[in-house]
Amino acid sequence: MMTGTIETTGNISAKKGGSVILQCHLSSTMAQVTQVNWEQHDHSLLAIRNAELGWHIYPAFKDRVAPGPGLGLTLQSLTMNDTGEYFCTYHTYPDGTYRGRIFLEVLESSVAEHSARFQIP
């Protein structure tokens, strides 16, 4: 039975040209996290973090995506095209798969505020 819960940073905004941390956290389960995948709104992979083999960054994003902190992902040099949904997929044993959603809005304004609160989707 899947008892876990994914908490995410929810809806966040950040300034064009700046950076943002995408963060998910799996709680309420003793399952072993074997891999975390980070995907964009069109379900294309940004990065994979395998528990044993480490981070794998999609080549097209290697200059704009930094691993971490932790199982999270840092997006840098943000453009307006980065606006949209991001998904963290936790592959676990024995529970199976957990998925969290984050919505990122990239703003032109210099007053863009990066909210770092965690919420349960």
């Epitope: 074997t34 891999q35 995948n37 995907e39 379900h43 294309s44 992979l45 994979i48 395998n50 528990a51 044993e52 083999l53 480490g54 981070w55 794998h56 960054i57 999609y58 080549p59 290697k62 691993p67 592959h91 044993y93 798969t97």
Partner: antibody, heavy 120, light 107 residues
Framework: DVQLVESGGGLVQPGGSLKLSCAAS????????MSWVRQTPDRRLELVAT????????YYPDSVKGRFTISRDNARNTLYLQMSSLKSEDTAMYYC?????????????WGQGTTLTVSS | DIVLTQSHKFMSTSLGDRVSITCKAS??????VAWYQQKPGQSPKLLIY???SRHTGVPDRFTGSRSGPDYTLTISSVQAEDLALYYC?????????FGGGTKLEIK
């Protein structure tokens, strides 16, 4: 040049045990996760064990869980696979493999393999 | 576990021909697919990763592509040294799994 050299294969009876070794050179062994991949006589490939760079995290598929143990000695640049309660279906060529660089998704370095035969 | 199906165990081709080796995933694996080549008596060699990224030193006649759950390794003009076994592998979900292999042979 990266080199992975497996050893320790042989003929074992069902229920027996064996320990394979993989000597690594040409890269900073302690910085990389490592895997064992086997190839059965019908040429199928199966990932059987993976370990992180410091040995603190391991992964096994259900087919070998509880019977195989992966470990490493970073001081000796050596990867190990301890196999017990061996079955005829464990008969295979065993390769150690790794990948370098965070862009690579897959195994870009493989050893030459060592053969395990489980038979009475 | 995710199953990768290489429906052709053998493929016959002529030197200079264009050939496409296919791999179908049982569920979405996005771009987390690699292709390997294995020649007789050798260990597998990485050709393609992230579905379409060519590994260092791999000739540009090898191309990887994706259409939904179907992944294709294309050799634009088959050379004698390309006659080998080809495997796909997914890394989207643990355990990472391999296809059953396709053996490329000369007609």
């Amino acid at each position: 040049d990266v080199q992975l050299v497996e050893s320790g294969g042989g003929l074992v009876q069902p229920g027996g045990s064996l320990k394979l070794s993989c000597a690594a050179s040409g890269f900073t062994f302690s910085s990389y996760g490592m895997s064992w991949v086997r190839q059965t006589p019908d040429r199928r490939l199966e990932l059987v064990a993976t370990i992180n760079n410091n040995g603190g995290s391991t992964y096994y598929p259900d087919s070998v869980k509880g019977r195989f143990t992966i470990s490493r000695d970073n001081a000796r640049n050596t990867l190990y696979l301890q196999m017990s309660s061996l079955k005829s279906e464990d008969t295979a060529m065993y390769y150690c493999a790794t990948r370098t660089g965070t862009e690579i998704l897959g195994f870009d370095f493989w050893g030459q393999g060592t053969t395990l035969t489980v038979s009475s | 576990d995710i199953v990768l199906t290489q429906s052709h165990k053998f493929m016959s081709t002529s030197l200079g021909d264009r050939v496409s080796i296919t791999c179908k995933a049982s569920q979405d694996v996005s771009t987390a697919v690699a292709w390997y080549q294995q020649k007789p008596g050798q260990s597998p060699k990485l050709l393609i990763y992230w579905a379409s990224s060519r590994h260092t030193g791999v000739p540009d006649r090898f191309t990887g592509s994706r259409s939904g759950p179907d992944y294709t390794l294309t050799i634009s003009s088959v050379q004698a040294e390309d006659l080998a076994l080809y495997y796909c592998q997914q890394q989207y979900s643990t355990p990472w799994t391999f296809g059953g292999g396709t053996k490329l042979e000369i007609k």
